[in-house]
């Protein structure tokens, strides 16, 4: 997983990386495998009904440094992990949803009493 504070520009890979893709397969993927010059990722987030949804796929080198930094987004429970060490490395990534904060209940669209 990339560290939150990491700010170095990503180094171009000399070769293509293959990743597992699920719910996030581009048109040029085959048999749920996509290819990239950047990173493989697995992400977990809540859908509109509050259920956890896992997606995985490829991130292009351009912009992936930012996307792989797991920056908290207000009112959104989401976690992403990225890898490059081998093909389909994202099969072994298991991000977990960050814990609910009290203010999530107050500020969210549904008010709990």
């Amino acid at each position: 997983k990339k560290e939150d504070g990491e700010s170095t520009a990503p180094t171009p890979r000399p070769k293509v990386l293959r990743c597992k893709c699920h719910h996030h397969c581009p048109e040029d993927s085959v048999n749920n495998i996509c290819s990239t010059d950047g990173y493989c990722f697995t992400m977990i987030e809540e859908d509109d009904s509050g259920l956890p949804v896992v997606t995985s796929g490829c991130l292009g080198l351009e912009g992936s440094d930012f996307q792989c930094r797991d920056t908290p987004i207000p009112h959104q429970r989401r976690s992403i992990e990225c890898c490059t060490e081998r093909n389909e490395c994202n099969k072994d990534l298991h991000p977990t949803l960050p814990p609910l904060k009290n203010r999530d209940f107050v500020d969210g669209p549904i008010h709990h009493r």
Partner: antibody, heavy 116, light 112 residues
Framework: QVQLQQPGPEFVKPGASVKLSCKAS????????VQWVKQRPGQGLEWIGE????????LYNQNFKGKATLTVDTSSSTAYMQLSSLTSEDSAVYYC?????????WGQGTTLTVSS | DVVMTQTPLSLPVSLGEQASISCRSS???????????LHWYLQKPGQSPKLLIY???NRFSGVPDRFSGSGSGTDFTLKISRVEAEDLGVYFC?????????FGSGTKLEIK
């Protein structure tokens, strides 16, 4: 300089198997994929598949699944392609090639002749 | 599979003349990363192919500047501004956007 060395011609009988080799030098073997390409006389080029020597990950053209098996030996920087149940249709020149996002260097090719 | 259609199949030219080869793909070759993986190779008789142009328009190291590539999406062109004797052979286009990777059927450049 980058080199992919392939041995001379191979002559085999129908039904047999053959293992073609490709010795890489002049670069870090695990930093690039190795692809294999078939060329029949007077015909075009046909992509067989590729292997990533860093993790032995393979991708095959569906047309060659069950026909070709790709392996590597990282200690000798050598890639191999085994072709099984050979028929006259397998007679061709087989090239190995270095692949990053495109093929930049090719071996000189091994001519395979399948004949009784 | 992506079909790569090259025209013409044979191209007779005089030395010093310009030559132009077209390559058309059955699907867009723009990859999801934004790159277009369309490449050109020259195969001389009895030799293995040699890379000329990668990713549409980038000349490979050591390739003379009389070779240029252009195009986008599904339509691509290789131009040789002044043909020299050493340029004779078969030119192939190739795509590495979609698996399985595929090649054009080749264009034979020959002396008129």
């Amino acid at each position: 300089q980058v080199q992919l060395q392939q041995p001379g011609p191979e002559f085999v009988k129908p039904g047999a198997s053959v293992k073609l080799s490709c010795k890489a030098s002049g670069y870090t073997f695990t930093s690039y994929w190795v692809q294999w390409v078939k060329q029949r006389p007077g015909q075009g080029l046909e992509w067989i598949g590729e292997i990533d020597p860093s993790d032995n990950y393979t991708l095959y053209n569906q047309n060659f699944k069950g026909k070709a098996t790709l392996t590597v030996d990282t200690s000798s920087s050598t890639a191999y392609m085994q072709l099984s149940s050979l028929t006259s249709e397998d007679s061709a020149v087989y090239y190995c090639a270095r692949f990053g996002f495109y093929v930049d260097y090719w071996g000189q090719g091994t001519t395979l002749t399948v004949s009784s | 599979d992506v079909v790569m259609t090259q025209t013409p199949l044979s191209l007779p030219v005089s030395l010093g003349e310009q030559a132009s080869i077209s390559c058309r793909s059955s699907q867009s070759l723009v990859h999801s990363t934004g790159n277009t993986y369309l490449h050109w190779y020259l195969q001389k008789p009895g030799q293995s192919p040699k890379l000329l142009i990668y990713k549409v328009s980038n000349r490979f190291s050591g390739v003379p500047d009389r070779f240029s590539g252009s195009g986008s999406g599904t339509d691509f062109t290789l131009k040789i501004s002044r043909v020299e004797a050493e340029d004779l052979g078969v030119y192939f286009c190739s795509q590495s956007t979609h698996v399985p990777f595929t090649f054009g059927s080749g264009t034979k450049l020959e002396i008129k």
